[in-house]
């Protein structure tokens, strides 16, 4: 009896694992084995596919074959008993194009209201992704074990921290990798669960902001209790993306070690140009808080996001405010090459009640003022980029008296 060729061959590639699956064409024939050959582009001869010779099952693994993953290859299969079937040729394919990203390795650490997630590729030193190791981004799904309500977080890197969680609560999550450059979305990791700890006695510092004054950076934060000491650490932001580098630790900012106020001042030359992460920790001598949320700090934007300069034209019931470019030392205007929005705060000189206007325009009207009354105005600029949510310090307050009645035209 003539043996029929096997049919419906599927090639599954996950990371560096190459698996072939196929259907027997004749289930009634026993003791059949199967063998594969492969052929590289531009070659005429077929080569025996190691790992896939004389296979009795309908699955084989040819991961040991050292292929150029960017080069097209062709496969063929035949059945063998006393005689052999004709060859069945599989459509040619490029391993890299066909490959799926496997589940990443996930490692969790818990705090009281945060989980630290460390993600690394599932296959160490993968040949398939050798040129893309630093291009992986990850997305995750997280849920409270008790509720099952899922939250998705996209575009994270190899180290990520999720804040604002509940203490003593079990959270579960799964992570998948993506290579956006190749439009590849990976397979989810197994589900990992971790319980957050009891609530820490000391909360972390909050609302960290960086501003520029003279040649210094001023770092400010809020804290619940008095008589504390604080320390501030920094890290290059790009290191979050690099899963293979174990060498970079958070570093102290020398002028911000053991400070007793909720701010510290350090020279601009502490940081070269770049994007950094900053974090703050509080201590009362016996206990230490967990680290604050990390804030992103871009020296380029920070250095040049100066408070706006403005002129006021006073009318009886309003001010017209004209916002200009801030001046550097030497009185040259600073060119802001990114869009800004302006926050204008004004108040009656004799009162503490502040009112606020947010405007994208550089000419702003402050309405509903009383005649012959002194009002004070201060302003600051914000970047409109969500990721680099930066603000200048407020300008000095300028106080002006409104005109007598009937001069509003």
């Amino acid at each position: 009896k003539n043996l029929k060729s096997p049919q419906k061959v599927e090639v599954d590639i996950i990371d560096d694992n190459f698996i072939l699956r196929w259907n027997r064409s004749d289930e009634s024939v026993g003791n059949v084995t199967f063998s594969f050959d492969y052929q590289k582009t531009g070659m005429d001869n077929w080569i025996k596919l190691s790992g896939c010779q004389n296979i009795t099952s309908t699955k084989c693994n040819f991961s040991s074959l050292k292929l150029n993953v960017y080069e097209e290859i062709k496969l063929r299969i035949r059945a063998e008993k006393e005689n052999t079937s004709s060859w069945y040729e599989v459509d040619s394919f490029t391993p890299f194009r066909k490959a799926q990203i496997g589940p990443p390795e996930v490692h969790l650490e818990a705090e009281d209201k945060a989980i630290v997630i460390h993600i690394s590729p599932g296959t160490k030193d993968s040949v398939m992704w050798a040129l893309d190791g630093l291009s992986f981004t990850y997305s995750l799904v997280i849920w409270k074990n008790s509720s099952g309500v899922e939250e998705r977080i996209e575009n994270i890197y190899s180290r990520h921290k999720i804040y604002k969680l509940s203490p003593e609560t079990t959270y579960c999550l799964k992570v998948k990798a993506a290579l956006l450059t190749s439009w590849k979305i990976g397979v989810y990791s197994p589900v990992h669960c971790i319980k957050t700890t009891v609530e820490n006695e000391l909360p972390p510092p909050e609302n960290i902001e960086v501003s520029v004054q003279n040649q210094n950076y001023v770092l400010k934060w809020d804290y619940t209790y008095a008589n504390m000491t604080f320390q501030v650490q920094w890290l290059h932001a790009f290191l979050k993306r690099n899963p293979g580098n174990h060498l970079y630790k958070w570093k102290q900012i020398p002028d911000c070690e053991n400070v007793k106020t909720t701010q510290c001042v350090f020279p601009q030359n502490v940081f070269q140009k770049g994007i950094y992460l900053l974090r703050v920790q509080a201590s009362d001598g016996n206990n230490t808080s967990f680290w604050s949320e990390e804030i992103k700090f871009d020296t380029e934007i920070q250095a040049f996001l100066l408070p706006p300069v403005f002129n006021i034209r006073s009318l009886s019931d309003s001010f017209h405010i004209y916002i200009g470019a801030p001046k550097q030392s030497g009185n040259t205007p600073v060119i802001q090459d990114y869009p800004l929005i302006y926050e204008i705060i004004f108040w009656e000189n004799t009162s503490n009640a502040e009112r606020k206007i947010i405007e994208k325009k550089t000419d702003v009207t402050v309405p509903n003022l009383k005649p012959l009354t002194v009002y004070c105005v201060k302003a600051r600029a914000h970047t409109m980029d969500e990721k680099l949510n930066k603000s200048s310090v407020f300008s000095d307050a300028v106080c002006e008296k409104t005109k007598p009645g009937n001069t509003s035209k």
Epitope: H107, A110, D112, H118, S158, G244, N245, K249, N287
Partner: antibody
């Protein structure tokens, strides 16, 4: 496999200098920080600090600032610990330990240890 | 500095026992705790990291638990080769600190 091979035992007098070496093999030396841990006789383990094997920058724990120096011979995949002006309390076994973490380092535990080098200080 | 306290310096055990070694941190360190085994004349071996994750090649009779300030290493079915010193270590904050150790002895 991954190994850290330390230099042999040392007998020194107070005031002398000792240099201990730790040769790494089986992994890329400049990818992982090297830490040093002290164990005095009958005592527990005490972390001394670490050296960035890529930049050569050392970080010392407060108790080990001054007479202690970490250095590298990168081409030989070797980290060194030098103790100057030896004192009686320096008598201990010193371990080099490679970080076991697979992510940057505010989370550092030790997956690979050297066998330890015993330093005896005696006049 | 964060102090790691192992209150029991010595523990007497027999083969087949279930043994629990405790470690207390002077402040909340989350789950950033590792456990090591040290036998005489040998270097320490990592058993557990992240409070409860077993390191590669460690037998599954070793389990770690706890978070915050209280941590436990449990050996579910004590073997003679498990007679050793056991140390905990916190790695939430620098300087990294170890417990003083608990020595398992034969009853």
């Amino acid at each position: 496999q991954i190994q850290l091979v330390q230099s042999g035992p040392e007998l020194k007098k107070p005031g002398e200098t000792v240099k201990i070496s730790c040769k790494a093999s089986g992994y890329t030396f400049t990818n992982y920080g090297m830490n040093w841990v002290k164990q005095a006789p009958g005592k527990g383990l005490k972390w001394m600090g670490w050296i960035n094997t890529y930049t050569g920058e050392p970080t010392y724990s407060d108790d080990f600032k001054g007479r202690f120096a970490f250095s590298l011979e990168t081409s030989a995949s070797t980290a060194n610990l030098q103790i100057n002006n030896l004192k009686d309390e320096d008598a201990a076994t010193y371990f080099c330990a490679r970080e076991g973490a697979i992510y940057y380092g505010d989370y550092v535990y030790f997956g690979v240890w050297g066998a330890g080098t015993t330093v005896t200080v005696s006049s | 500095d964060i102090v790691m306290t192992q209150s029991q310096k010595f523990m007497s055990t027999s083969v087949g026992d279930r043994v629990s070694i405790t470690c207390k941190a002077s402040q909340n360190v989350g789950t950033a705790v590792a456990w090591y085994q040290e036998k005489p004349g040998q270097s320490p071996k990592l058993l557990i990291y992240s409070a409860s994750n077993r390191y590669t090649g460690v037998p599954d009779r070793f389990t770690g638990s706890g978070s915050g300030t209280a941590f436990t290493l449990t050996i579910s079915n004590m073997q003679s080769e498990d007679l050793a010193d056991y140390f905990c270590q916190q790695y939430y904050n620098y300087p990294l600190t170890f417990g003083a150790g608990t020595k398992l002895e034969v009853k």
